[in-house]
Interface confidence: medium
C-alpha cells in the first residue's frame, strides 16, 4: 500500500549552520557572523557567547557551535559552561569572602580551589598515623598500632576543634 505523505516543513531541510529565512521564501541562509545554529531546521541563529573580561576564549564560535570560555590565569570555572570564574588560592588555603585564608590546624587543601577538609582520622579505621598531615596534605595512615614493632610510636592528631571547611576570620 502507498503511505500518505505528510506535508514536510521546508525548514527541516536547513542544516546546522544555517537558518530558515522567512523573508526569503524559507530558503536556508547561512548564519550571520557571530552567530550559530547547532541543529537543523532552526528559524533563527543564536548569538555567539563572547568571552570577555575575566573570561577568555577556549574554543572559537563557529557557524554550528557556540564559543566556549574558560577563566584567565588565577581563576577557575564554576557553573554550567563556565558561567562564573572564581579566584584561585594556593594549596593549603581556602577562599572565603575575605580572600584566601590558610587552612586551620587539622585541615588541609591539596588544590587551588575548594575548602579545607579535616585530616583523616586514622584511629577510626584502627590505624595509626604514618605521616603527619600539613595544610597542603592529608595524613597518611599506616598499620594499626598493634601491628607496629615494639617501641614504635604513633602520632594521632587531635580532632579539629571547629566545623570543617571554615577558616577563622
Amino acid at each position: 500500500f502507498e503511505r500518505t505523505r505528510s506535508l514536510q516543513d521546508p525548514c527541516s531541510n536547513c542544516p546546522a549552520g544555517t537558518f530558515c529565512d522567512n523573508n526569503r521564501n524559507q530558503i536556508c541562509s547561512p548564519c550571520p557572523p557571530n552567530s550559530f545554529s547547532s541543529a537543523g531546521g532552526q528559524r533563527t541563529c543564536d548569538i555567539c557567547r563572547q568571552c570577555k573580561g575575566v573570561f577568555r576564549t577556549r574554543k572559537e564560535c563557529s557557524s554550528t557551535s557556540n564559543a566556549e570560555c574558560d577563566c584567565t590565569p588565577g581563576f577557575h570555572c564554576l557553573g554550567a559552561g563556565c558561567s562564573m570564574c572564581e579566584q584561585d588560592c594556593k594549596q593549603g588555603q581556602e577562599l572565603t569572602k575575605k580572600g584566601c585564608k590558610d587552612c586551620c590546624f587539622g585541615t588541609f587543601n591539596d588544590q587551588k580551589r575548594g575548602i579545607c577538609r579535616p585530616w583523616t582520622n586514622c584511629s577510626l579505621d584502627g590505624k595509626s598515623v604514618l605521616v603527619n598531615g600539613t595544610k597542603e596534605r592529608d595524613v597518611v595512615c599506616g598499620p594499626s598500632p598493634a601491628d607496629l614493632s615494639p617501641g614504635a610510636s604513633s602520632v594521632t592528631p587531635p580532632a579539629p576543634a571547629r566545623e570543617p571547611g571554615h577558616s577563622p576570620q
Epitope: 573580561g53 575575566v54 573570561f55 584567565t72 590565569p73 588565577g74 581563576f75 564554576l78 558561567s83 562564573m84 570564574c85 572564581e86 579566584q87 594556593k90 577562599l95 569572602k97 575575605k98 580572600g99 584566601c100 585564608k101
Partner: antibody, heavy 122, light 107 residues
C-alpha cells in the same frame, strides 16, 4: 553591559545621616556583588564595604563599623549606602561599584557609578 | 590590613614616552593586583586585573606585570588621553586596599 547611576549631591550637618542610592541597569541587582568606595578631596580611594548576593552577606570596613548600613531594593534594582553620625572628615565623593559579571570574589571594581559628592558642614 | 605603596607619586612625561609605575604590597598578594585610571571629576576606570589581564576595551599600550609583592604598570607609548592619576589595588584579602596614586602630568 552593567551601568550604575547614583543619586545627586548632598549637603549635611555634622551628626546627621546620608543615604546614597545606586541604580543598576543592564543586569539585575541579584546577579551582582556591590561595593562602596569613597574618595575624600585630594585624597586616595578607600573601600567601605561589600555586599555578596550568593548568600546575602555584607562586609564592612572596620573603620565604618556601626556607622554604615548597606541595603538593597531588588525590586527596584537599587543599592543604598547609609552613613550616620557624619563629621566633617566624611566629606567625600562616594562611589558604588560592582565586579565584572560572572566573577566570584574577584574583588576588583568595574564598572563604577558616577559618584555622589557628600559635603558635611555646619 | 595590607598596605600598598606606589612610586613615584607623580611624574612628568611627553606624548610617546614609555611610562612605568610601580606598586609594592606590604605582604605577598600573589597576582591579586588591579590597576585603575582616574581623570579629574570622573570615576576610576579598571585597566588591568589579576596583575596582567587587560580589561575589555583598554588599549594594548597598557600592560601589567609582577607577582608577590612587586608590580608594574607600563604605558608603552603615552597618548594625550593617558594623562591622569593611576591607582593600584590589592584584591587578595579584605579589606581591599589602594595605593596612594601616581599622577601622570604633561612635561
Amino acid at each position: 553591559e552593567v551601568q550604575l547611576v547614583q543619586s545627586g549631591a548632598e549637603v549635611k550637618k555634622p551628626g546627621a545621616s546620608v543615604k546614597v542610592s545606586c541604580k543598576v541597569s543592564g543586569y539585575t541587582l541579584t546577579e551582582l556583588s556591590m561595593h562602596w568606595v569613597r574618595q575624600s578631596p585630594g585624597k586616595g580611594l578607600e573601600w567601605m564595604g561589600s555586599f555578596y548576593p550568593e548568600d546575602g552577606e555584607t562586609i564592612y570596613a572596620q573603620k565604618f563599623q556601626g556607622r554604615i548600613t548597606m541595603t538593597e531594593d531588588t525590586s527596584a534594582d537599587t543599592a543604598y549606602m547609609e552613613l550616620s553620625s557624619l563629621r566633617s572628615e566624611d566629606t567625600a565623593v562616594y562611589y558604588c561599584a560592582t565586579e565584572g559579571v560572572g566573577v566570584i570574589r574577584g574583588n576588583w571594581f568595574d564598572p563604577w557609578g558616577q559618584g555622589t559628592l557628600v559635603t558635611v558642614s555646619s | 590590613d595590607i598596605q600598598m605603596t606606589q612610586s613615584p607619586s607623580s611624574l612628568s612625561a611627553s606624548v610617546g614616552d614609555r611610562v612605568t609605575i610601580t606598586c609594592r604590597a606590604s605582604q605577598s598578594i600573589s597576582s591579586y593586583l588591579n590597576w585603575y585610571q582616574q581623570k579629574p571629576g570622573k570615576a576610576p576606570k579598571l585597566l588591568i586585573y589579576a596583575a596582567s589581564s587587560l580589561q575589555s576595551g583598554v588599549p594594548s599600550r597598557f600592560s601589567g606585570s609582577g607577582s608577590g609583592t612587586d608590580f608594574t604598570l607600563t604605558i608603552s607609548s603615552l597618548q594625550p588621553e593617558d594623562f591622569a592619576t593611576y591607582y593600584c589595588q590589592q584584591s587578595y584579602s579584605t579589606p581591599p586596599t589602594f595605593g596612594q596614586g601616581t599622577k601622570v602630568e604633561i612635561k
